[in-house]
Interface confidence: medium
Amino acid sequence: AGLKLMGAPVKLTVSQGQPVKLNCSVEGMEEPDIQWVKDGAVVQNLDQLYIPVSEQHWIGFLSLKSVERSDAGRYWCQVEDGGETEISQPVWLTVEGVPFFTVEPKDLAVPPNAPFQLSCEAVGPPEPVTIVWWRGTTKIGGPAPSPSVLNVTGVTQSTMFSCEAHNLKGLASSRTATVHLQLVPRGSSAHHHHHHHHSAWSHPQFEK
């Protein structure tokens, strides 16, 4: 069986939320059992069509209505022929969208006027991703390349911080971190606290 992907480039870049149909053409077999494979695992769902063009020419379609980051990867189709599995050339599917946060600023409790740090990291594609920092409704830092650490010399009241990630597809806003004031026991001096408070909160879920 001559097996090839039809009309699809080796690298396919699609914007998040857009539809994609991957095509696979199988010639030289009367009844191919076409399987789609993503990153080595057979795609086990019904988002597939198999169309006989002629007796020995079939086209398989893998249809994705609205791609998201988890759909990115290496796709190929395969058929069994005489006990051997033949595989097609792969298609690399890249899903582009607004930045996705891998680290967002975390809530902290710090003594008055004590220095602390907040972390923010976001990824594409597309890259590069730049970070802008906000204190309440005031822009206070950036744009700087991701990842970014905001060094704050101290606060005297509970304050809200957030970061914004930008790339060619647009921007995404992080969660808002609240930095609370730690109650300091009488007799201790707040400005003697020089240790840094790190924020490295991971946000694995991706919500469309």
Partner: antibody
Framework: EVQLVQSGADVKKPGASLTISCQAS????????ISWVRQKPGKGLEWMGQ????????LYGPSFQGHVTISADRSTATAYLQWRSLEASDTAMYYC??????????????????WGPGTLVTVSS | SYELTQPPSVSVSPGQTARITCSGD??????AYWYQQKSGQAPVLVIY???KRSSGIPERFSGSSSGTMATLTISGAQVEDEADYYC???????????FGGGTKLTVL
């Protein structure tokens, strides 16, 4: 012309076994999937499961898994829906449906379906 | 198990626009299909892949999908459009199909 010819209406008692059939013509049976769809009297449509004539690979809806068996005979281009032990709640019209697609210009699939006329199954003591 | 939710009934006057909705958590990722079933007849595919009209279906029938909601629109409904309409889609897992509960369209 694509045709799906279903077996005639049947009346059975609870606990009886039954097989109904759907014979396909006008196309290559092994090229397509055939689904079975249930419609109880005065109620909506329910997808039961499907079989691909080519490899007799089957898929079932969660409500029907284990209660019915879908099979096919390639030599006669016929799909079957089988019960080992009928219940009164199985009383319904059963449709077989051929799923299909054609290509326009060789790359864009256009979806279509052919439905059989239905087989009425009545289960009553 | 996965469900698609439709309103039980929709009524319009002849010439008005009828809209029938179908909601399901997987619809942002799975295509919706629409069937028309007239009394005593087998269903007919009207719309496939959210918005594509099946061959032989009048242009007044259209489909759309946004988020978790798919919509069948009949612009200028006619008396002969009176029927039950069902949406149909893949489950969130993609392993089985599901019909909505059906909507009875009355064209008064």
């Amino acid at each position: 012309e694509v045709q799906l010819v279903q077996s005639g209406a049947d009346v059975k008692k609870p606990g009886a076994s039954l097989t109904i059939s759907c014979q396909a013509s006008g196309y290559t049976f092994t090229d397509y999937w055939i689904s079975w769809v249930r419609q109880k009297p005065g109620k909506g449509l329910e997808w039961m499961g499907q079989i691909r004539g080519q490899h007799s690979s089957t898929l079932y809806g969660p409500s029907f898994q284990g209660h019915v068996t879908i099979s096919a005979d390639r030599s006669t281009a016929t799909a079957y829906l089988q019960w080992r032990s009928l219940e009164a709640s199985d009383t319904a019209m059963y449709y077989c449906v051929r799923h299909g697609a054609s290509t326009s210009g060789g790359t864009i699939p256009e979806y279509y379906q052919h439905w059989g006329p239905g087989t009425l199954v009545t289960v009553s003591s | 198990s996965y469900e698609l939710t439709q309103p039980p009934s929709v009524s319009v006057s002849p010439g008005q626009t009828a809209r029938i909705t179908c909601s399901g958590d997987a619809l942002p990722k799975k295509y919706a299909y629409w069937y028309q079933q007239k009394s005593g007849q087998a269903p007919v595919l009207v719309i496939y892949e959210d918005a594509k009209r099946s061959s032989g279906i009048p242009e007044r029938f259209s489909g759309s999908s946004s988020g978790t909601m798919a919509t069948l629109t009949i612009s200028g409904a006619q008396v002969e459009d009176e029927a039950d309409y069902y949406c149909y889609s893949l489950s969130d897992s993609g392993n089985y199909f599901v019909f909505g509960g059906g909507t009875k369209l009355t064209v008064l």
